[in-house]
Amino acid sequence: SGTTNTVAAYNLTWKSTNFKTILEWEPKPVNQVYTVQISTKSGDWKSKCFYTTDTECDLTDEIVKDVKQTYLARVFSYPAGNVESTGSAGEPLYENSPEFTPYLETNLGQPTIQSFEQVGTKVNVTVEDERTLVRRNNTFLSLRDVFGKDLIYTLYYWKSSSSGKKTAKTNTNEFLIDVDKGENYCFSVQAVIPSRTVNRKSTDSPVECMGQEKGEFREI
């Protein structure tokens, strides 16, 4: 059963990056408002974003409680404003979202190269360990804290003077690579979760090149 004068939400979509998770839907409301409910498969339906005219709801606080759970959301439509009222007690119209498992599906945010340091013919490249909104013991966890060894980084590097790229991989946040003495190199990294079937890779980080401020060089 539904309430008169309302349109059910549609195109319910999860938008999630590094566990920052927002449910989006359509349409823009006319004489109606929305309330979102979220649940785990075995849990209770918890109301969020009460009676909103927005078409998105930030559900980060809920999903970070257990990122390995599978969540389902639903969006209720209620008539609002100066509309004809029936006094109906029936359950309002609602639409279910697709299921969403944050650990398996959140997009990996674009990584950042924190620093690189050259020591002779070796370069140590460090990837910034981005903070997430996942908490443990009142402390925000980093991406590495959450994913552990499931998360790897791929480093792409090349001589500034050529286009031939080399790659390296690490399951930490550091690379140690061999370079030719006297050559400047450029670097880009990508976060990867090889075990995933969807959203396996992040976009590439901004390119950083030797001879710019990020690096430190020591000839030994």
Partner: antibody, heavy 118, light 106 residues
């Protein structure tokens, strides 16, 4: 049907604490937000705070922050509102109220009169 | 916080008459709720989301308004309608209630 039954009237001394209970029946207790609202004699209504029994998530009115604690016991389907450092201005009827379709204060308990007097 | 001002504070009318109660918000709100309270009883929800009748509420009650100005209308007062009426908003935290309008028998 939804029923919210509150504990009986209380008389308290200034500086002491009071804990009011609200026993719910007729629905799945853990699935709905529970709110607390008070009404001083001859006055309007004031929201105190709320709890989601499913996970214990709670929020409070800043005016009561530090003095109020709202809890829920899923095993007995009972919500509690504890107010400390009582003063005479806290004399009021305290209501528990539950969300419904289209409104957060849809179902109300019968109220508990708390009198703070020396 | 949003302050809701109800007017008049007291409305003296006879059964069968039309009652119009006003609620003015200190800032624009999305929608308004209305409650009825009788002596010794808890408030009872009448209108939600500005104009929707709550379950079991007679059709003689209606709500309208937008922005800062909202009204509750009782088209023809019945003896059981004499009570105190409160408006309430939750567009902004904390939720707030108006001071009430008492509708008494003239």
């Amino acid at each position: 049907q939804v029923q919210l039954v509150q504990s009986g009237a209380e008389v308290k001394r200034p500086g002491s604490s009071v804990k009011v209970s609200c026993k719910a029946s007729g629905y799945t207790f853990s699935s709905y937000w529970m709110y607390w609202v008070r009404q001083a004699p001859g006055q309007g209504l004031e929201w105190i705070g709320q709890i989601y029994p499913g996970d214990g998530d709670s929020n409070y009115n800043e005016n009561f922050q530090g003095r109020v604690t709202i809890t829920a016991d899923k095993s007995t389907s009972t919500a509690y509102m504890e107010l400390s450092s009582l003063r005479s201005e806290d004399t009021a009827v305290y209501y528990c109220t539950r969300e419904g379709y289209g409104n957060r204060f849809a179902y109300w308990g019968q109220g508990t009169l708390v009198t703070v007097s020396s | 916080e949003i302050v809701l001002t109800q007017s008049p504070a007291l409305l003296s009318l006879s059964p069968g008459e039309r009652a119009t109660l006003s609620c003015s918000a200190s800032s624009s709100v999305s929608y308004m709720y209305w409650y009825q309270q009788k002596p010794g009883q808890a408030p009872r929800l009448l209108i939600q989301l500005t104009s929707n009748l709550a379950s079991g509420v007679p059709a003689r009650f209606s709500g309208r308004g937008s922005g800062t100005d909202f009204t509750l209308t009782i088209s023809s007062l019945e003896p059981e309608d004499f009570a105190v009426y409160y408006c309430q908003q939750w567009s902004y935290n904390p939720p707030t209630f108006g001071g009430g309008t008492k509708v008494e028998i003239k």
